[in-house]
């Protein structure tokens, strides 16, 4: 006889990276007929929802109206059908951003490179942090960690056109509290033989559209909660 129900999916909308004082919704998707959902934060019960009518609902939402560092951390959820509880969901790392300061991001040898050249990103932040994160925009929300007193290096190795895209970095005060994002750097990779010297390191869009990026770039992942769950879970491990 089955002792537990399958684990639910957990994700954050619009994104697991939440600017401070902005709103976020944590979604938990279980099964139709679940009479109770529990959201746990850092291992303790945080909130409970009892959907009505349970047979018509398989997802609940826990709304956080005002994100701050106390709300940042690891969330999981479980649900109950009758007396039977589910396995806990994977952990969702909810990150508060726009804390304290803004790092600067530079790329060597420059933002326009030729396929096969080795590229290194440098993220610098003068305030007290020793961990840095480099993110490339796009579906996979690929994150690299780097360490250093005021700056960190992110070597990409010999680049291909797959490395094309817009990059930003953050300083991390702890695993779940990140700085403001840096201005974006758009990396252009060409296979052509052409003079790319002194190609300006222009931002592709201003910093205030970062919020829009958070709302839009993970759409594909939100449609596939399993993949999104996996991405969020592995981000900070």
């Amino acid at each position: 006889q089955q002792q537990t129900l399958p684990k639910p999916f957990i994700w954050a909308e619009p994104h697991f990276m939440v600017p401070k004082e902005k709103q976020v919704t944590i979604c938990c998707q279980g099964n139709y007929g679940a009479v109770e959902y529990q959201l746990h934060f850092e291992g303790s019960l945080f909130a409970v929802d009892r959907p009505k009518p349970p047979e018509r609902i398989n997802k609940v939402q826990f709304y956080i109206p005002d994100m701050n560092s106390r709300m940042a951390g690891q969330y999981s959820c479980i649900y109950r059908v009758g007396e039977l509880w589910s396995e806990p969901s994977n952990l969702l790392d909810l990150v508060v951003t726009e804390m304290y300061d803004t790092p600067t991001l530079s790329v060597h040898p420059g933002p326009e490179v030729i396929s096969g050249e080795k590229v290194t990103f440098y993220c610098r932040l003068d305030t007290a942090t020793s961990m840095f994160l480099l993110l490339k925009e796009g579906r996979s929300s690929h994150v690299q960690r780097g360490y250093g007193k005021v700056q960190a290096e992110f070597p990409l190795g010999p680049v291909t056109t797959a490395h094309r895209g817009t990059y930003r970095c953050f300083g991390s005060y702890n695993n779940h509290a990140w700085s403001f994002p840096s201005e974006p750097v758009k990396l252009l990779v060409t296979g052509d033989i052409e003079n790319t010297s002194l190609a300006p390191e222009d931002p592709t869009f201003p910093a205030d559209t970062w919020g829009t990026y958070l709302l839009t770039t993970e759409t594909g992942l939100q449609k596939d909660h399993a993949l999104w769950d996996h991405t969020a879970q592995n981000l900070l491990r």
Partner: antibody, heavy 115, light 107 residues
Amino acid sequence: QVQLQQPGAELVKPGASVRLSCKAFGYTFTSYWMHWVKQRPGQGLEWIGMIHPNSGVTKYNEKFKSKATLTVDKSSSTAYMQLSSLTSEDSAVYFCAGDGRFAYWGQGTLVTVSA
Amino acid sequence: DIQMTQSPSSLSASLGERVSLTCRASQDIGNSLNWLQQEPDGTIKRLIYATSSLDSGVPKRFSGSRSGSDYSLTISSLESEDFVDYYCLQYASSPWTFGGGTKLEIK
């Protein structure tokens, strides 16, 4: 026309410090890396370090970490390298080179360390 | 640090001759290699970047290529102003390092 302007020569006493300048013309100074390179008389080239004027990121050759300090003045589009505790080993020509790939070079400053 | 072994250290050749200079990298540097030219007065000019990209204003007789960890600068037909010093430079892994140089002399 991109140009990197460096003074021709500096004569300094042993134990003293010197600040070398490199003024950039003809491009957006803040957008590109600036490198510094050493060449001893009749010898090859040695990379000292680089600075990104916009971000303030610096990267040094470990060999020169306690010898050289790189700074910039964005308002005058000038890069500086301070060399400290000078000895005869520091007598050399010092070049600045603009752009991550060393696209443009200054004429070099001859530093002579002599009592 | 990555060692760049440049050969030959000096080379005597005649006007119109085709010559090749080589740099061998001790570690993988991808295509992150420049060739530089230094005149007797100390002036340095970049000829080639990213292994094979010719700088604007550089004569077409100069070309760069790669075979594994060996990088070559070829001058297809030597002219009088080519008899100067040449250096390779890798910018793949910090500290960026130079080859020991090749002195090209007229025969």
